[in-house]
Interface confidence: low
Amino acid sequence: QPPPPPPDATCHQVRSFFQRLQPGLKWVPETPVPGSDLQVCLPKGPTCCSRKMEEKYQLTARLNMEQLLQSASMELKFLIIQNAAVFQEAFEIVVRHAKNYTNAMFKNNYPSLTPQAFEFVGEFFTDVSLYILGSDINVDDMVNELFDSLFPVIYTQLMNPGLPDSALDINECLRGARRDLKVFGNFPKLIMTQVSKSLQVTRIFLQALNLGIEVINTTDHLKFSKDCGRMLTRMWYCSYCQGLMMVKPCGGYCNVVMQGCMAGVVEIDKYWREYILSLEELVNGMYRIYDMENVLLGLFSTIHDSIQYVQKNAGKLTTTIGKLCAHSQQRQYRSAYYPEDLFIDKKVLKVAHVEHEETLSSRRRELIQKLKSFISFYSALPGYICSHSPVAENDTLCWNGQELVERYSQKAARNGMKNQFNLHELKMKGPEPVVSQIIDKLKHINQLLRTMSMPKGRVLDKNLDEEGFESGDCGDDEDECIGGSGDGMIKVKNQLRFLAELAYDLDVDDAPGNSQQATPKDNEISTFHNLGNVHSPLK
């Protein structure tokens, strides 16, 4: 082992370095002192550090560590924040266009139903937006309300346009008849199924992205313990006390310290991995009736079909409802009052579908691919931080927390540290409360994501297949068939897709650079002068 270099007889270098951290020199000894009051940088001989300096070093070390952690997560944080915003806006645009489409359908095909229809459509899509953003609304209720509201207008304007004003007090009866007589056939049920499935998935997708932001924000702003602060001080600053200004910590030693400091954070790793994989599974299933873009942009067509269905049966319906709602607002009727053969819906169901065009689904897949590159983010954090802070290459001629060594030995370092501080103890303390809370939230979202992940290769659920919907023939010239007649597949209609080029240029080059990061104590960071890696906030 080489002898330590001769100590600075005047502590001059230490004084000039420390002055960058703390203007004024009152805490720095002019010449080396015994340092018997030191608690972290325990001296083997005379030292240029005082207890006050040690405290300042500890504070600075913890601040540096927080900066390093923020720097490490910056790219990932930017990726999720940007995507959450982009997708939220994209979904809102889809809803807006779906509303425009539906209004246009009414305007072009049923002008007599406007403006009431516009009002009902507007309310429905407002609810859709609110639901996606997490509002506690029942999708079935939304769809029921839309059809309950539409039917009285359809009945009085389309089916019975000559109805005297005195008969217009039958709205409540008509609303009830709508459900009991299934006047729209199975279309409301079909819309409920499609809308609820696609919106549930959309909603949890956004929830998951927002939780991702919360996870990063939580770990980004962790306050490191005093024990960790002491370890970091010993690694980064105690060498200064001996006048070893240019010495870098040993890489292996840095890894040991970081694993100790990050022990709680690293516990997130298992749940973070599961989060990304579960999100991927969810995204892989977001197609056809699980893709809100498909479903909502095709709604105008299904609603149109449902009104045509009413018109097709208008004759029998008018007779039946005339009897049921004749002179009373009271609902005296029952489903049995209408002939059983009246509402058999043989209509082919159309689900909006587009072959693999560049739409939101490809954006989602792109996000997942980027996220997967961060799957080991938490387990790799200690190593990442060491590689982005000044450490000695090859563990040669480096600082091991006590002295300058020719080669780092983890065993020797551990033995030497036993009387000062027990690394094992730090690891055994378990994660901080905030980390435990975020782990619980990750467990919860992972469970939700798993519940929502759809079985592959199915277009509709089994229970929907059993509703009596039929695949029909592939005759309409604007329709196409997917799959054979006996495989549970259904006829689909091509739909326009918006948002093909939704701004999504989230290259890392666009991420705010370190220079833009808030560094409240820049003067404290400069301690590392030119030792920092180019990516390190410690430069």
Partner: antibody, heavy 123, light 105 residues
Framework: TVTLDESGGGLQLPGGALSLVCKGS????????MFWVRQAPGKGLEYVAE????????YYAPAVKGRATISRDNGQSTVRLQLNNLRAEDTGTYYC????????????????WGHGTEVIVSS | ALTQPSSVSANLGGTVKISCSGG????YGWYQQKSPGSLPVTVI????KRPSDIPSRFSGSTSGSTSTLTITGVQAEDEAVYFC???????????FGAGTTLTVL
């Protein structure tokens, strides 16, 4: 009254880049989608790019995708089209156009046009 | 692609209809250009809406995937090329027809 003034055209070298700027006035700029449409000599109109009112959504025609970037500065009421790796077929008059609202129906929803700026790509 | 006739003619004061089909989005706009390179003027947007400075003789209607521009009481100054615009697919959200030359007789 709505006015749209384009600038930045002129003679460009193949493989080079051009930057066109359109300044809008007479309307609340940030509330409307903006477009670039071009017309090659003796040809019809060709959609180039579109940007939403906030700038968060962009759309590009296949002919320019990967080479074009549309951006906007609502503070300055300007929209910019950056077109890289220029080709002879990029020659034509480039028009700036205003959408009817902040989520217009792309080429179905233009209600005002600029006078255009001529771009010639030639060596 | 959008399909429109290459040329139509109309008598002064008469009525002319120009059709355009093929827009999968079923939303159309109509744009008038009096000479190549001059600024286009929107006569109809979003299927049937007319800018305030456009005379009421211009109207638009859409049925299914076909849009029709109707000019009733054609004037000499209406002689121009009329382009329809729509969107074809998410890969090509904006598209224009090749243009229809209106000749006033």
């Amino acid at each position: 009254t709505v006015t749209l003034d384009e600038s930045g055209g002129g003679l460009q070298l193949p493989g080079g880049a051009l930057s066109l700027v359109c300044k809008g006035s007479g309307f609340t700029f940030s509330s409307f989608n903006m477009f670039w449409v071009r017309q090659a000599p003796g040809k019809g109109l060709e959609y180039v790019a579109e940007i939403s009112g906030t700038g968060s959504s962009t759309y590009y025609a296949p002919a320019v995708k990967g080479r074009a970037t549309i951006s906007r500065d609502n503070g300055q009421s300007t929209v910019r089209l950056q077109l890289n790796n220029l080709r002879a077929e990029d020659t034509g008059t480039y028009y700036c156009a205003k959408g009817v609202d902040s989520d217009s129906w792309t080429a179905a929803g233009i209600d005002a046009w600029g006078h255009g700026t001529e771009v010639i790509v030639s060596s | 692609a959008l399909t429109q006739p290459s040329s139509v003619s109309a008598n002064l004061g008469g009525t002319v209809k120009i059709s355009c089909s093929g827009g999968t989005g079923r939303w159309y706009g109509w744009y008038q250009q009096k000479s190549p390179g001059s600024l286009p003027v929107t006569v109809i947007y979003s299927n049937d809406k007319r800018p305030s400075d456009i005379p009421s003789r211009f109207s638009g209607s859409t049925s299914g995937s076909t849009s029709t521009l109707t000019i009733t009481g054609v004037q000499a100054e209406d002689e121009a090329v009329y382009f329809c615009g729509s969107r074809e697919s998410s890969r090509n959200p904006g598209i224009f027809g090749a243009g229809t030359t209106l000749t006033v007789l």
